[in-house]
């Protein structure tokens, strides 16, 4: 949602968190701002304090309940407002009617671990975190492997077009240090985006057996 010179973007993690970023040209100095969430069909409402993340943008997390509680559904609409204090009053800076399941960004996958490693291959598994049971199997993943002498940006993306919480990396170089990351995205939602990348998992392939080609 854009109001005046501001931009207000929020994502739902599919369970109990709405994360918002508000950016404003000609930023207000020393002003207290909040995001207010008012669902259309729930008894609760929630507020979070916007904190600066850069010169002209602020962010906050609306914690709607315990991490794995299902606080919203696809039929919910949440009115989200940015309110800033001016004098003793509050002034609305931005507003949007937020459809949570059209604006999804899941938490980064967790618990990455090496299941099995060989000289040229490595099998890695992970878990998704705080993802709604509504998705059933309608998730996709992207993964990338960091090779020595390269950057993450140069790493080719591997796409898993189904809910598959493991991958077998092949054609690896023996006795080499690698890092691996994965991210997840639901198939649902017009404005849905990829989760952040997982914490990198470092692993080393086994050395080639001596005396073998």
């Amino acid at each position: 949602a854009v109001n005046g010179t501001s931009r207000f973007t929020c994502f739902y993690n599919s369970r109990a968190n709405i994360s918002c970023v508000w950016s404003q040209d000609g930023a207000l100095q020393d002003t207290s701002c909040q995001v207010h969430a008012w669902p259309d069909r729930r008894r609760w409402n929630q507020t979070c304090e916007l904190l600066p993340v850069s010169q002209a943008s602020w962010a906050c997390n609306l914690i709607l309940g315990t991490p794995d509680s299902q606080k919203l559904t696809a039929v919910d609409i949440v009115t989200l407002r940015v309110m800033c204090r001016e004098g003793v009053r509050w002034r609305m800076m931005a507003i949007q009617d937020f459809k949570p399941f059209e604006n999804l960004r899941l938490m980064a996958p967790i618990s990455l671990q090496v299941v099995h490693v060989e000289t040229h291959r490595c099998n890695i598994s992970w878990k998704i975190s705080q993802a709604s049971h509504y998705f059933e199997r309608h998730l996709e993943f992207e993964a990338r492997t960091l090779s020595p002498g390269h950057t993450w940006e140069e790493a080719p993306l591997m796409t898993l077009k189904q809910k598959q919480e493991w991958i077998c990396l092949e054609t690896l170089t023996p006795d080499t240090q690698y890092e691996f990351q994965v991210r997840v995205k639901p198939l649902q939602g017009e404005f849905t985006t990829w989760s952040p990348w997982s914490q990198p998992l470092a692993f080393r392939t086994k050395p080639a057996a001596l005396g073998k080609d």
Epitope: N3, G4, T5, S6, G26, E86, V88, R89, W90, R91
Partner: antibody, heavy 121, light 112 residues
Framework: EVQLVQSGAEVKKPGASVKVSCKAS????????ISWVRQATGQGLEWMGE????????YYNEMFKGRVTMTRDTSISTAYMELSSLRSEDTAVYYC??????????????WGQGTTVTVSS | DVVMTQTPLSLPVTLGQPASISCRSS???????????LEWFQQRPGQSPRLLIY???NRFSGVPDRFSGSGSGTDFTLKISRVEAEDVGVYYC?????????FGGGTKVEIK
């Protein structure tokens, strides 16, 4: 019916203080802001600042900072504006006015009848 | 502070005729949220100010439709389509976009 009833006229000597009251009725006192505006004789209007009775938070126009104090007593739905170190230029009609806690549309909708303060030696 | 300048200072009008008051701000009063908090108040003789118009062109409840507001940026106008006897008084513009909020000096409307 929303009503703001202010205290009566005051005559003060230079250097003294004056405290004007504004009693609210017809709405929930702690849900709205009370602004104070003054009008010197034959002059325009000047916004002095405001108080939110819900938490007692105040904001003063720089021009009056250090001389003005706004308070409230929620038990009797009354707001007060005290102006100290009075000088002849402070001779004016002082108004209280109600405003929404969230400034969505307008600053002040309902006004008190005004209190005349005369500063004279 | 934003200085609000009104013209004319005095406006003699004939009953039933239109009247127009101008208000100019010393800087743009579009708030950073995109709204323009320009308001008009009427003060009849011996009375308290009364809100007529808010956010440039919106009439407050109970205000007759002969009152209208227009303008943008730094230039604003209050129009009375057909002046009635009860419209006599002083009219003030007010900006609520930048603290401290400020009023114009006022325009006195009187019957010729």
């Amino acid at each position: 019916e929303v009503q703001l009833v202010q205290s009566g006229a005051e005559v003060k000597k230079p250097g003294a203080s004056v405290k004007v009251s504004c009693k609210a009725s017809g709405y929930t006192f702690t849900d709205y802001v009370i602004s104070w505006v003054r009008q010197a004789t034959g002059q325009g209007l000047e916004w002095m600042g405001e108080i939110y009775p819900g938490d007692g938070n105040t904001y003063y126009n720089e021009m009056f900072k250090g001389r003005v104090t706004m308070t409230r007593d929620t038990s009797i739905s009354t707001a007060y504006m005290e102006l100290s170190s009075l000088r002849s230029e402070d001779t004016a009609v002082y108004y209280c006015a109600r405003g929404s806690y969230t400034y969505d549309n307008y600053a002040m909708d309902f006004w008190g009848q005004g209190t005349t303060v005369t500063v004279s030696s | 502070d934003v200085v609000m300048t009104q013209t004319p200072l005095s406006l003699p009008v004939t009953l039933g005729q239109p009247a127009s008051i101008s208000c100019r701000s010393s800087q743009n009063i579009v708030h950073s949220n995109g709204n323009t908090y320009l308001e008009w108040f009427q003060q009849r003789p011996g009375q308290s100010p009364r809100l007529l118009i808010y956010k440039v062109s919106n009439r407050f409840s109970g205000v007759p439709d002969r009152f209208s507001g227009s303008g943008s940026g730094t230039d604003f106008t209050l129009k009375i389509s057909r002046v009635e006897a009860e419209d006599v008084g002083v009219y003030y513009c007010f900006q609520g976009s930048h603290i401290p909020w400020t009023f114009g000096g006022g325009t006195k409307v009187e019957i010729k």
